[in-house]
């Protein structure tokens, strides 16, 4: 911490300008009025203060606003935001999307830091839900943002916000997250026609149940193998060979290359070999002809 010393004659800052770059830390502490700094925060980012000088400026703001900075200051923090700790940020009340954007811009190109995560958490909690504009903004800066949320947090996403989600935003989502997002997407896109609907719903299908996959198989959607491989294994297993063939269309030939990987491997084990042979792909591992298949899960349910 910079010790308190009187400001030298003629060095009292009348405004935040470039001359301050050449002040020593103690001079900044002694000669820059915290209230002046707060009212001219928009200038700070345009001045190439050193890392150490930014520490002094932060200290001055902390003294002026011990309960947390007002949004008028937060919006103009610029690179000073990188000096904030999660504890500092928890004191803030950020309500403006413009403020959020301004701070995310500072961190652009870097991974999500603890500061950013805290800022987003504060912002979303303040809004009560992850609305479309917020989601638009967050996924623009952090394509993996949606997949960093827990299923519980995702449950607060209104279906209308799903329109803001791009396929790449879901790249790192696990099945539990897609289980939450898929019904919302289904609801959001329900009024679209077949082919348009499939284009939009495709990246969410990792959360789709068997009955929805069966319905899609009747719509000539030609699902690609990459999408098929991301489907829930338990949703794929009950599909018949005919249904999978219809679901994949011309892409069905890709099953051969994936026959050793889930869910294709597990699905093959559940199909009759003679049914698999009808595909003409040389898929092996199905149930031999003449064998009886007992669905024990169904038997347990009946008893």
């Amino acid at each position: 911490e910079v010790e308190k010393t009187a400001c030298p004659s003629g060095k009292k800052a009348r405004e935040i300008d470039e001359s301050l770059i050449f002040y020593k830390k103690w001079e900044l502490e002694a000669c820059v009025d915290a209230a002046l700094l707060a009212t001219q925060m928009d200038r700070v980012n345009a001045i190439p203060f050193t890392y150490e000088q930014l520490d002094v400026l932060k200290h001055k703001l902390d003294e002026l606003y011990p309960q947390g900075y007002p949004e008028s200051v937060i919006q103009h923090l610029g690179y000073l935001f990188l000096k904030m700790s999660p504890e500092d940020i928890r004191k803030w009340n950020v309500t403006s999307l413009e403020t959020l954007k301004a701070l995310l811009e500072v961190n652009k190109g870097h991974e999500m830091s603890p500061q950013v995560a805290t800022l987003i958490d504060r912002f979303v909690k303040g809004r009560g839900q992850l609305d479309k504009d917020t989601l638009d903004t967050l996924t623009a800066f952090y394509p993996g943002y949606l997949c960093s949320l827990s299923p519980e947090e995702l449950s607060s996403v209104p279906p209308s916000s799903i329109w803001a989600v791009r396929p790449q935003d879901l790249d790192t989502c696990d099945p539990r997250q897609l289980d939450v997002l898929y019904p919302k997407a289904r609801l959001a896109f329900q009024n679209m026609n077949g082919s348009e609907y499939f284009v939009k719903i495709q990246s969410f299908l990792g959360g789709a149940p068997t009955e929805d996959l069966k319905a899609l198989s009747q719509q000539n959607v030609s699902m690609d193998l990459a999408t098929f491989m991301k489907l829930r294994t338990d949703a794929v297993l009950p599909l018949t060979v005919a249904e999978v063939q219809k679901l994949l269309g011309p892409h069905v030939e890709g099953l051969k290359a994936e026959e050793r990987h889930r869910p294709v491997r597990d699905w093959i084990l559940r199909q009759r070999q003679d049914d698999l042979d009808t595909l003409g792909l040389g898929l092996q591992g199905g149930i031999p002809n003449g064998y009886l298949v007992l669905d024990l899960s169904m038997q347990e349910a009946l008893s």
């Epitope: 470039e18 001359s19 050449f22 190439p48 203060f49 890392y51 690179y79």
Partner: antibody, heavy 119, light 106 residues
Framework: EVHLQQSGPELVKPGASVKISCKTS????????MHWVKQSHGKSLEWIGL????????SYNQKFKGKATLTVDKSSSTAYMELLSLTSEDSAVYYC????????????WGQGTTLTVSS | DVVLTQSPAIMSASPGEKVTMTCSAS?????MYWYQQKPGSSPRLLIY???NLASGVPVRFSGSGSGTSYSLTISRMEAEDAATYYC?????????FGGGTKLEMK
Amino acid sequence: EVHLQQSGPELVKPGASVKISCKTSGYTFTEYTMHWVKQSHGKSLEWIGLINPYNGGTSYNQKFKGKATLTVDKSSSTAYMELLSLTSEDSAVYYCARRGYDNEGFDYWGQGTTLTVSS
Amino acid sequence: DVVLTQSPAIMSASPGEKVTMTCSASSSISYMYWYQQKPGSSPRLLIYDTSNLASGVPVRFSGSGSGTSYSLTISRMEAEDAATYYCQQWSSYPPTFGGGTKLEMK
């Protein structure tokens, strides 16, 4: 050991532009501001401006605004100065210099880059 | 801009002699910095914050002053001290350098 290595001498025609580099090593590049200084033949030193590698912020001597453009490449810890619309008045030795902690002088200097502007 | 005027412009000294050169500022400044430059070489920081010796600088060098008047002293001149010496300030924006004092060996 701190080292500032500048690019070699340049001979350019009037009206052209030139970009001088200053590759640093031996310290954390983003923790110190980099300054550029001009020394005309047999003359004193003139401060051109500075760049803060931490955030890319710049500050220029009014006299060199529009003449010099300062940039950095953090990945290679290198500072650059581009000089535009060159005239014979720009012929000089140009130095990059690191500003010491808490404004304690220009503590390390590059070896200098000689620029000759001639047709 | 703050103008720094160095005097004398040229001086000479014998080995072992005490040498003092001055730097006068057109307005009051907080700190002065001194650099040594030999022909064909880059400037080298000698004194920072008016009176502090930079790393590796011999103790025969010292700096003093305040306000508008500053000086650099070499307690005992040595052959290797023959060079041009520049004062510099950045108390006022933009930073400026003096015109230099050329010190020659007698």
